[in-house]
């Protein structure tokens, strides 16, 4: 039975040209995290594998940095980066947990972080 929950940074905004940390946290389970996939719609950004380290998709290699932790840092933001991002936690023995983050990249300097929320 899957008892865990994914806590994410929720809805966030950032300035064009700036950077943002995409972060998820798995709680309420003792399951072992074996891999985390970071995806934007149907595009893979990166994989963090507990044994192997990081695989960064070449399409993003100049703008994506691994970490902190299992998170992902997105740099040199453009308005095209606006959209949904997913952290997909592969765990043993629970299975897969998915968290969602919505990022809005703003032209102005009025970027504020949204509240944290949980996905059961």
């Amino acid at each position: 039975m899957m008892t865990g929950t994914i806590e994410t940074t929720g809805n966030i905004s950032a300035e064009k040209g700036g950077s943002i940390i995409l972060q998820c946290h798995l709680s309420s389970t003792t399951a072992q995290v074996t891999q985390v996939n970071w995806e934007q719609q149907d595009q893979l950004l990166a994989i963090c594998n507990a044994d192997l380290g990081w695989h960064i998709s070449p399409s993003f290699k100049d703008r994506v940095a691994p970490g902190p932790g299992l998170g992902l840092t997105l740099q040199s933001l453009t308005v095209n980066d606006t959209g949904e991002y997913f952290c997909i936690y592969h765990t043993y023995p629970d299975g897969t947990y998915t968290g969602r983050i919505f990022l809005e990249v703003l032209e102005s300097s009025v970027a504020e972080h949204g509240a944290r929320f949980q996905i059961p």
Partner: antibody, heavy 127, light 112 residues
Amino acid sequence: QVQLQESGPGLVKPSETLSLTCIVSGGSIRSGDYYWSWIRQHPGKGLEWIGYIYYSGGTYYNPSLKSRVIISVDTTKNQFSLKLSSMTAADTAVYYCARGSIAARSGYFYFSGLDVWGQGPTVTVSS
Amino acid sequence: EIVLTQTPLSLSVTPGQPASISCKSSQSLLPSDGKTYLSWYLQKPGLPPQVLIYEVSNRFSGVPDRFSGSGSGTDFTLKISRVEAEDVGVYYCMQSIQLPLTFGGGTKVEIK
């Protein structure tokens, strides 16, 4: 020498779920140097990659199929499996399992070529 | 996803003559680690594909030295220096630098 052998039904009814298993012999699926893939080939057509699994359970699926695909691994039986749901005639194909090499260096890893392939059963979707 | 385009679609070769197959990528397969993850496969009739070349130019164990691979960026080539009867089949290139893995459409090689 590692060998892969697929097993599963040759005929599936429309809307049903295809279940295939790939048995690994001559080596351990727990080797950290490899990823394990499923690939299919429609009749007279080219090759389409379905997805991969690592021995510890990490997966990635082709976005074109990901809503219908589950790949799992059973290290105790030295095998990995494919489930493809909501089958239609368009899913009629030869389904191959294959082993790919992983290159890991300095905290990063990369996917290399597919060096061992199963024989691939033909799966037909028909009522 | 990365699209790989192979040319020609088919090739009819006299035994002992050379053959060349091109694989062009929709985006650069620029390596992050100094290696380009482009491989070549031969699928003989009724059999699964078998790897010939990995990482652009490395011959897989047991592959005859008449097969060679080259290229960089977006343009890659498989050459057979002297085609033999056993070389008939469909040749595929595959990239694994970016997921999903993708294959070229294939080049059918037959003997004249």
